[in-house]
């Protein structure tokens, strides 16, 4: 979280930002609120990012204002009008780029004051893990597969009745390059499982954290999965 | 759940003051704006103020400037308007309304002020 | 000021009827508009916000619609319930305005 006040003649106000992750090809989120102003003719809120030119968004008397934007963004931004009278400055931003990654700054005018705040945007690519029984293998072997990350991600395998054991040995990752040749697909298996335990595939990179689960018995499979962005730090 | 529970009914004498609260629940009181809005008998809506809690930061529609005070107290999330110089005219229903998702959204049940000799 | 005019200040309708009021500022707005229904004793009700949103719980009936200085809440098929007084308020500019009210009473 990132808090950040104004330095003006007039008051300042309090600006807020949360560090966040964007997934390339869609579409993302920069979080930024501030101390809401009954006045919305009156709000101005401006985007900008360290090393661009232009403009990323800038957001004034109750309209978007996209004279300045800077080419990298035409056409890829909005603000939530609706929600900018109640201190809503976020900015969505359409087909996320790996080129998107930066720092941002999040800067506020209203009748009140200025104020502004920064945000670490990162860029890569993650998804959620399947993780199935491989029935086309010699022994019983679980499939864990997710079609996009970057970078390169690493996989742990762990097990419920094996707590702490190393799978490294009894498992084998490959990365498959996708079709856009930057996002890769991947693939690991883990062999000589035995039944009545959770297997839990563990894919993570410096933005993301995902894990798929699988529990095997004689009578049932059961999945679970769940993804968690690592770096959502407020300012 | 959101919640704006206001006081109870008042009976002023002309040149007489009023103050009627507003006691809110369910979202931060002190990170937004709070609205004071009347309505006379048989007649539209009329705003009268805002105040945002966390600052005391008030505003003011020009017609009442100098007779309305609004106030707020961020231990009780409650917020007050106080009328002065009460006038037969200012017979009516007033409403504090608040602006958490957007504006005017949450309104509190009203409180009828009558101003009779 | 922003002066709204809203219009008509009432009509008479049958439920099932299509019904269409419509608000008028003195200037451009930029769709920072909201309507409100109102029943007799009861404080103004959250239905529509920024011209054309539906708050929660608000039944798909109810839409709004406009841009500049002309907007427009359009009931595609009134229902009993619907019988009240509707308001616009333009947040725009300050101070907040609203309209005059529309009544909409059973025909």
């Known amino acids: 979280l990132i808090i950040g006040f104004g330095i003006s003649g007039r008051h300042s106000i309090t600006v807020t930002t949360v560090a966040s992750a964007g997934n390339i090809g869609e579409d993302g989120i920069l979080s930024c609120t501030f101390e809401p102003d009954i006045k919305l003719s009156d709000i101005v809120i401006q985007w900008l990012k360290e090393g661009v030119l232009g403009l990323v968004h800038e957001f004034k008397e109750g309209k978007d204002e996209l004279s300045e934007q800077d080419e990298m963004f035409r056409g890829r931004t909005a603000v939530f009008a609706d929600q900018v009278i109640v201190g809503n400055a976020s900015l969505r931003l359409k087909n996320v780029q790996l080129t998107d990654a930066g720092t941002y700054k999040c800067y506020i005018i209203t009748s009140k004051g200025k104020g502004n705040a920064n945000l670490e945007y990162k860029t890569g690519a993650f998804s959620m893990p399947e993780v199935n029984v491989d029935y086309n293998a010699s022994s019983e072997t679980l499939r864990c597969e997710a079609p996009r990350w970057f970078p390169q991600p690493t996989v742990v395998w762990a097990s419920q009745v094996d707590q702490g054991a190393n799978f490294s040995e009894v498992s084998n990752t490959s990365f498959e390059l996708n079709s856009e040749n930057v996002t890769m697909k991947v693939v690991s298996v883990l062999y000589n499982v035995t039944i009545n335990n959770t297997y839990s595939c563990m894919i993570e990179n410096d933005i993301a954290k995902a894990t798929g689960d699988i529990k095997v018995t004689e009578s049932e499979i059961k999945r679970r999965s769940h993804l968690q962005l690592l770096n959502s730090k407020a300012s | 759940e959101v919640q704006l529970v206001q006081s109870g009914a008042e009976v002023k004498k002309p040149g007489a003051s009023v103050k009627v609260s507003c006691k809110v629940s369910g979202y931060p009181f002190t990170s937004y704006w709070m609205h004071w809005v009347r309505q006379a008998p048989g007649q539209g809506l009329e705003w009268i103020g805002a105040?945002?809690?966390?600052?005391?930061?008030?505003e003011y529609a020009p017609k009442f400037q100098g007779r309305v005070t609004l106030t707020a107290d961020t231990s009780t999330s409650t917020a007050y308007m106080e009328l002065s110089s009460l006038r037969s005219e200012d017979t009516a229903v007033y409403y504090c309304?608040?602006?958490?998702?957007?504006?005017?959204?949450?309104w509190g049940q009203g409180t009828t002020v009558t101003v009779s000799s | 000021d922003i002066q709204m005019t809203q219009s008509p200040s009432s009509l008479s309708a049958s439920v099932g009827d299509r019904v269409t009021i419509t608000c008028q500022a003195t200037?451009?707005?930029?769709?920072?508009l909201n309507w409100y229904q109102q029943k007799p004793g009861k404080p103004p009700k959250f239905l529509i916000y920024?011209?054309?949103q539906l708050a929660e719980g608000v039944p798909s009936r109810f839409s709004g619609s406009g841009s500049g200085t002309d907007y427009t809440l359009t009931i595609s098929s009134l229902q009993s319930e619907d019988f009240a007084t509707y308001y616009c308020?333009?947040?725009?500019?300050?101070?907040?305005?609203f309209g005059g009210g529309t009544k909409v009473e059973i025909k």
């Open positions: 200037q451009d707005i930029v769709k920072s």
């Open positions: 105040i945002y809690p966390g600052k005391s930061d008030t």
């Open positions: 920024y011209t054309a």
């Open positions: 308020l333009q947040f725009y500019e300050f101070p907040p305005t």
């Open positions: 309304t608040s602006t958490w998702t957007h504006y005017f959204d949450y």
